[in-house]
């Protein structure tokens, strides 16, 4: 029988009559055109629709969109198209939603060919309602909030301007023209790349990187030869064109520009590209794209000034056609990541670190789960899971990994169990202690979704027919009810519920269709009833984030520290609540080489958790770039993980001395970096 | 081997207090928790609460909750349970028991290694 | 909390016997149950958990099964060293003790 459906599994009781209380339908009243929806704030219940239905004519496409509001989850929707003067709204732009609960919305619409401007609509009482702006400009960009103040906000124009508003757009000036690409740092900083000559295209490598930090009042130029920069963590990066070819290198910066540092990453070439993983306040994930069409590169892990960079993994998936990878970040675990490598006989297979990238192994077989037939041996063989790269080759996969902060532990995915990705038609399993172990949890393809911090588990089957039930979990996945939602099948096109996975309400989303007509239909569903009672204290139980090895007197220890947390027991059927937090417990550990990552020079043989030089390297001096010095590195081979807590135990130590000569790299240097005023 | 020593036998006044103590040697003490469970006479076995070493997480059992205090010291790597307002009720044979753990789960495992129980008597 | 409940609370057997004992708990407990066996004057010993792992060093005469809120533990051949009293214990929730079978010579 398929997971959970036996007859021993814990039913929830009366459980249909309390769903069926709770369950909430709405038909849009529209033509099926496309449909996109947009929680709005924290924990208001606010919900914007917008439906749109395009009209191909022989000249332009003509449009009608609709808008519509709920404020209660979902349960209700109000249609205020009138609102945007029924204006149709172009989808590209999406619904421009404001930081944490400003209530600020930013909708950008279709207009006439002549105009001299874009129009957009404007609200910041959570969509109750809206201004209309007409724009100085034609945006090509989606209206950028900044992180700090919501007021302001900044857009890209057709003709490559970069326009900024300090009163949430309602006035608008130009600040710079030529403008490629354009993000907000910290603290209302704006960084830029700009051209001067040609356009984006024709001038990339010779771009130059530009900061405000007074809104455009004054700028300052940070680098030169620029192809391209991000932001992540606390790290500014930058690709710089090389003097003497077209290679490229990346430069780091930690003070938002005012200094840089060469990576010790490899240069790369034309059709070679550098990806941020992930990035944090403490390190950075750098993908390093192989030379050649291969679709696999490496993975490097920086230390805490994103300057050296160990190798993490070889041979790491990503696509230079469609740009997929499937790196995952498991949020509910903390040093775990999940992605793709390509083996050398071009099968694809899941790797996962619980270090931070320290080391990467197989995930392990699920239990009760035979191989498959891209098993070699049908004893050993380990998980595989479908992310990113499966779904944009059309597999049968609804979804990518899901895992959320506040649910602990857990990890749900569509996966085989082979000895590669297979093609066959794949299961959905779940793993309640971060990656480390796994169980099938449903057979065949599933829309799944996480509510009250783990609480419920909700999923429905991923098929071409229309469907009207619905299949939920109140013990992280073991055992499953089923409730009929509708007598009606629906095409089922998308379970919706409020990011954070806080919420006990989820949206069911889909259309039907009759002869003459066919209509939007949402059923919201609340499960409050379910879960009938506040979690109390007997509810949870103490468990030790990874765990291997309870002899081990360092056992769980990951960074330095390890964790203890409260979690709720499976057999528990409670609300966590959305005031839920999770209680956690993190006490240091003693440092071993573990601890250490391998500095510039130095790797790590497989299976060894020493340090040793790197052959090529045996006798020479380590040179490298920092802050546009050369330094000279005296090391025995180790530096510390970043975020790496431990104390005392094994400590190789490391220094860097000052050589005063200055760097071979075409970048700037502070003193050749300039201030411009408005 | 991992043993559980117990402290040896009591004899108490009504409304008095006793301390067990539960001291483990040959094993790693701190990375399992340490439940208590009492056994009166000719009657079965009744969970008090436990701890878990690290962090000094305890729970209790309803029943004894705000009667019984259970500590852990990872120095020596031992175990206290205090009982106070004793009763002739509470007249057992109090053992201590190692949780089994194959996962970072505490308390999911049994209780693999046991102490030799300690007889507290309550009377007056 | 969860309640065990455990039968027979006495169980009349002999050498060689297959035997049998049950416990059912309030609530789904998924697998998180163990069985103990305890003898006069000595400490309880662990026998299964998880439902139905055996312990090491248990011999294989004894096995478990169950799962939810319906739990067995089986005595495939009864020994002359299996008459004791046996317990199953609950894990999932707060630590509950079924009330005991006890196993003595027919």
């Known amino acids: 029988s398929a997971p959970g459906e036996d007859e021993e599994c814990g039913r929830v009781r009366d459980f249909v009559a309390k769903l069926a209380n709770n369950t909430h339908q709405h038909v849009f009243d529209d033509l099926r055109g496309s449909v996109s929806l947009s929680w709005v704030g924290d924990s208001t219940g606010v919900i914007l629709v917008l439906t749109t239905f395009h009209v191909p004519l022989v000249i332009m496409t003509f449009g009608q969109s609709k808008l519509y509001r709920s404020e209660d989850y979902g349960k209700n929707f109000k249609d205020i198209t009138d609102l945007i003067n029924n204006t149709f709204i172009r989808t590209e732009f999406g619904m421009a939603i404001g930081p944490e609960n400003s209530g600020k919305v930013v909708l950008t619409a279709e207009v006439s060919g002549g105009s001299r401007g874009g129009r957009i609509f404007r609200s910041s009482d959570f969509a109750k309602n809206f201004v209309q702006t007409d724009l100085p400009f034609h945006p090509l960009t989606q209206m950028m909030y900044s992180p700090q103040n919501s007021d302001y906000l900044l857009a890209l124009s057709t003709e490559n301007g970069l326009w900024v508003s300090k009163n949430f757009g309602g006035k608008w000036e130009e600040i710079h023209k030529a403008v490629c690409l354009a993000k907000w740092g910290s603290d209302n900083t704006i960084f830029f790349t700009t051209y001067a000559n040609g356009s984006c295209k024709a001038d990339l490598g010779a771009l130059e990187l530009w900061r405000t930090s007074d809104l455009g009042k004054s700028f300052k130029t940070i680098g030169v030869k620029i192809y391209s920069f991000g932001l992540g963590g606390r790290f500014l990066f930058a690709s710089v064109m090389a003097d003497k070819d077209t290679t490229r290198r990346i430069h780091v910066s930690t003070d938002q520009g005012d200094t840089w540092s060469m990576a010790q990453l490899p240069s790369v070439g034309q059709e070679q590209f550098y990806s941020i993983l992930a990035a944090n306040d403490d390190m950075v994930f750098m993908h390093v794209d192989e030379p050649g069409d291969t679709g696999f590169g490496t993975i490097f892990t920086s230390d805490d000034r994103g300057i050296v960079y160990s190798k993490s993994l070889d041979r790491h998936l990503y696509t230079t056609t469609g740009g997929e990878t499937d790196f995952t970040n498991v949020t509910s675990l903390r040093g775990v990541y999940i992605t793709s490598v390509l083996s050398e006989d071009n099968s694809i297979q899941t790797m996962i670190t619980f270090d931070q990238g320290g080391r990467w192994t197989h995930l392990r077989k699920p239990e009760n789960s035979e191989c498959d037939a891209t098993a070699k041996n049908k004893n050993e063989c380990s998980l595989h899971i479908h992310a990113s790269y499966s779904i944009s080759q059309k597999l049968n996969v609804p979804m990518a990994p899901l895992s959320e902060p506040n649910a602990v532990g857990i990890v749900i995915a569509h996966g085989s169990v082979g000895d590669a990705i297979s093609v066959m038609v794949p299961d959905v399993y779940i793993s309640d202690d971060g990656g480390y172990s796994w169980t099938k949890m449903l057979e065949g393809p599933h829309y799944y979704t996480i509510l009250d911090s783990g609480g419920i588990i909700v999923a429905i089957e991923h098929s071409s027919r229309p469907i009207n039930v619905i299949k939920f979990s109140t013990d992280e996945g073991q055992c499953w009810q089923t409730y009929t939602f509708t007598r009606d099948p629906i095409y089922f096109t998308g379970l919706a519920s409020e990011p954070g996975a806080r919420s006990m309400n989820i949206s069911i989303w889909g259309f039907t269709e009759s002869f003459a007509t066919s209509q939007w239909v949402s059923y919201t569903i609340d499960f409050k009833d379910i879960l009938e009672r506040n979690c109390e204290e007997k509810d949870y139980t103490i468990w030790l984030a990874h765990s291997t090895d309870p002899e081990d007197y360092e056992d769980g220890c990951i960074l330095g520290y390890k964790e203890q947390f409260l979690r709720l027991r499976k057999s528990s059927v409670c609300q966590n609540g959305r005031d839920y937090v999770v209680t956690k417990q993190p006490s240091i550990c003693l440092c071993s080489l573990e601890d250490f990552l391998c500095d510039f020079g130095y790797y790590r043989p497989e299976n060894d958790s020493k340090c040793v030089e790197q052959p090529e390297l045996k006798g020479h001096d380590l040179e490298f770039c920092l802050y546009g010095r050369e330094e000279h590195l005296t090391t025995n081979g180790y530096r510390k993980i970043p975020g790496d807590k431990c104390q005392g135990g094994v400590n190789p130590v490391r220094e860097v001395k000052d050589l005063k000569k200055k760097c071979t790299s075409n970048f700037l240097s502070p003193e050749k970096q300039n201030s411009k005023s408005n | 081997q991992v043993q559980l020593v117990q402290s040896g036998a009591e004899v108490k006044k009504p409304g008095s207090s006793v301390k067990v103590s539960c001291k483990a040697s040959g094993g790693t003490f701190r990375n399992y928790a340490i439940s208590w469970v009492r056994q009166a006479p000719g009657q079965g076995l009744e969970w008090m609460g436990g701890?878990?070493?690290?962090?000094?997480?305890?729970n209790y059992a309803q029943k004894f909750q705000g009667r019984v205090t259970i500590t852990a010291d990872e120095s020596t790597s031992t175990a206290y349970m205090e009982l106070s307002s004793l009763r002739s009720e509470d007249t057992a044979v109090y053992y201590c028991?190692?949780?089994?753990?194959?996962?970072?789960?505490?308390?999911?495992?049994?209780?693999?290694?046991w102490g030799q129980g300690t007889t507290v008597t309550v009377s007056s | 909390d969860i309640q065990m409940t455990q039968s027979p609370s006495t169980l009349s057997a002999s050498v060689g016997d297959r035997v049998t004992i049950t416990c059912r708990a309030s609530?789904?407990?998924?697998?998180?149950l163990a069985w103990y066996q305890q003898k006069p004057g000595k400490a309880p010993k662990l026998l299964i958990y998880?439902?139905?792992s055996l312990e090491s060093g248990v011999p294989s005469r004894f096995s478990g099964s169950g799962s939810g809120t319906e739990f067995t533990l089986t005595i495939s051949s009864l020994q002359p060293d299996d008459f004791a009293t046996y317990y199953c214990q609950q894990a999932d929730g707060h630590i509950t003790f079924g009330g005991g079978t006890k196993v003595e010579i027919k």
């Open positions: 998880k439902a139905s």
């Open positions: 701890i878990i070493p690290i962090g000094g997480w305890a």
């Open positions: 028991a190692r949780q089994g753990r194959k996962t970072g789960y505490y308390y999911y495992y049994g209780m693999d290694v």
């Open positions: 609530q789904s407990i998924s697998s998180w």
